[in-house]
């Protein structure tokens, strides 16, 4: 399955909205750094077979779309970014789905990537986790859409990598 | 490859006006930001200020608050350190470095050549 | 601002000796600070960030340690290209500041 070039400019706009999202200054949130331990293994085309990776994108647009549709979330952001926010993330949930079903059978897909979409749960967890204990202070927030950001960029660039290993 | 590229050395006579440049490359400019840091002659490190290329937010040291301008333009992937009035006690080194910002990432991890700037009449 | 304080401020060591030097913050900064190398002429090099994480491709005779106002960069067995200048930085809160430096001569 060849990832769509929609597919990568929407998560290319997906990224200029969380830029935009931004609130108040990036400069007095640095001692809420954290470290979140990103699964950078799971995304490493060189390792694992493409649907996986396709399978481990799939899971990281999803828990965002979760993370981002809960009631804090909506209460630490502008409304209409966050609608077009989830319009691309949408786009590209069903970009992805129609990838992984083409790449291998519906019955596998579960079974093979168990390991990938379990690390990038455990991701999200650990973002929710520190979340909740900085009380969604707009600091936290902060500090998850710029690793949000992180892990997209992330990801953009390998979908890049993949598209050219085809 | 990541790399800053500053700007030549400058001599200047008081009064002048200057600006240095630091241009970012191998990496996505707007994803760090870049802080500046001064080293006068047989000094220490000072640090100056700092800017978020993606939407040109900065930050100073008091001790540079007002002396000092930075900006960046991210079209050209390069961020600026301005002066509008040097002073002899202006003459030093200038570097840039970039900052992960608000990841959890090695700070300061790419640093520039430096600028050399002499104030001198 | 906070301050950071380096000591010793320059100490003479050879070859092999293991050398510690020492940086106080005026206030917790938890874990945010790092340690920069600096040769003459040269920029400074990042050797240590959050405390005790080594950069990529710095050797693992440099370490460091401590947390809140309390930290220790540790070279185990200083080598001949070691003799330079290092400074603590706290990356906490804005303004960031450097310690004075420690200059690490030959004896």
């Known amino acids: 399955c060849d990832l769509p070039q929609t597919h990568s400019l929407g998560n290319r706009r997906a990224l200029i909205l969380l830029a935009q999202m931004g609130r108040i200054s990036h400069f007095s949130c640095l001692k809420d750094r954290y470290d979140f331990g990103f699964p950078q293994e799971v995304f490493d085309g060189n390792q694992f077979q493409k649907a996986q990776a396709i399978s481990a994108f799939h899971e990281m647009i999803q828990q965002t779309f979760n993370l981002f549709s809960t009631k804090d979330s909506s209460a630490a952001w502008d409304e209409t970014l966050l609608d077009k926010f989830y319009i691309e993330l949408f786009q590209q949930l069903n970009d992805l789905e129609a990838c992984v079903t083409q790449e291998v059978g519906v019955e596998e897909i579960a079974l093979m990537n168990e390991d990938s979409i379990l690390a990038v749960r455990k991701y999200f967890q650990r973002i929710t986790l520190y979340l909740m204990g900085k009380k969604y202070s707009p600091c936290a927030w902060e500090v998850v859409r710029a690793e949000i950001m992180r892990s997209f960029s992330f990801s953009t660039n390998l979908q890049k990598g993949l598209r050219r290993k085809d | 490859e990541v790399q800053l590229v500053q700007s030549g050395a400058e001599v200047k006579k008081p009064g002048e006006s200057l600006k240095i440049s630091c241009k970012g490359s191998?990496?996505?400019?707007?994803?760090?930001?870049i802080g500046w840091v001064r080293q006068m002659p047989g000094k220490g490190l000072e640090w100056m200020g700092i800017i978020d290329p993606s939407d040109s937010d900065t930050a100073y040291s008091p001790s540079f608050q007002g002396q000092v301008t930075i900006s960046a333009d991210k079209s050209i992937s390069t961020a600026y350190l301005q002066w509008s009035s040097l002073k002899a006690s202006d003459t030093a080194m200038y570097y840039c470095?970039?900052?992960?910002?608000?990841?959890?990432?090695?700070?300061?991890?790419?640093w520039g050549q430096g600028t050399l700037v002499t104030v001198s009449s | 601002d906070i301050q950071m304080t380096q000591s010793p401020s320059s100490l003479s060591a050879s070859v092999g000796d293991r050398v510690t030097i020492t940086c106080r913050a005026s206030q917790s900064i938890s874990k945010f600070l790092n340690w920069y190398q600096q040769k003459p002429g040269k920029a400074p090099k990042l050797l240590i960030y959050?405390?005790?994480s080594l950069q990529s491709g710095v050797p693992s005779r440099f370490s460091g340690s401590g947390s809140g106002t309390d930290f220790t960069l540790t070279i185990s067995s200083l080598q001949p290209e070691d003799f330079a200048t290092y400074y603590c930085q706290q990356s906490n809160t804005l303004p960031f500041t450097f310690g004075q430096g420690t200059k690490v001569e030959i004896k």
């Open positions: 959050f405390a005790s």
């Open positions: 470095a970039r900052h992960p910002g608000l990841n959890w990432a090695p700070d300061f991890d790419y």
């Open positions: 191998g990496y996505s400019f707007t994803s760090y930001w």
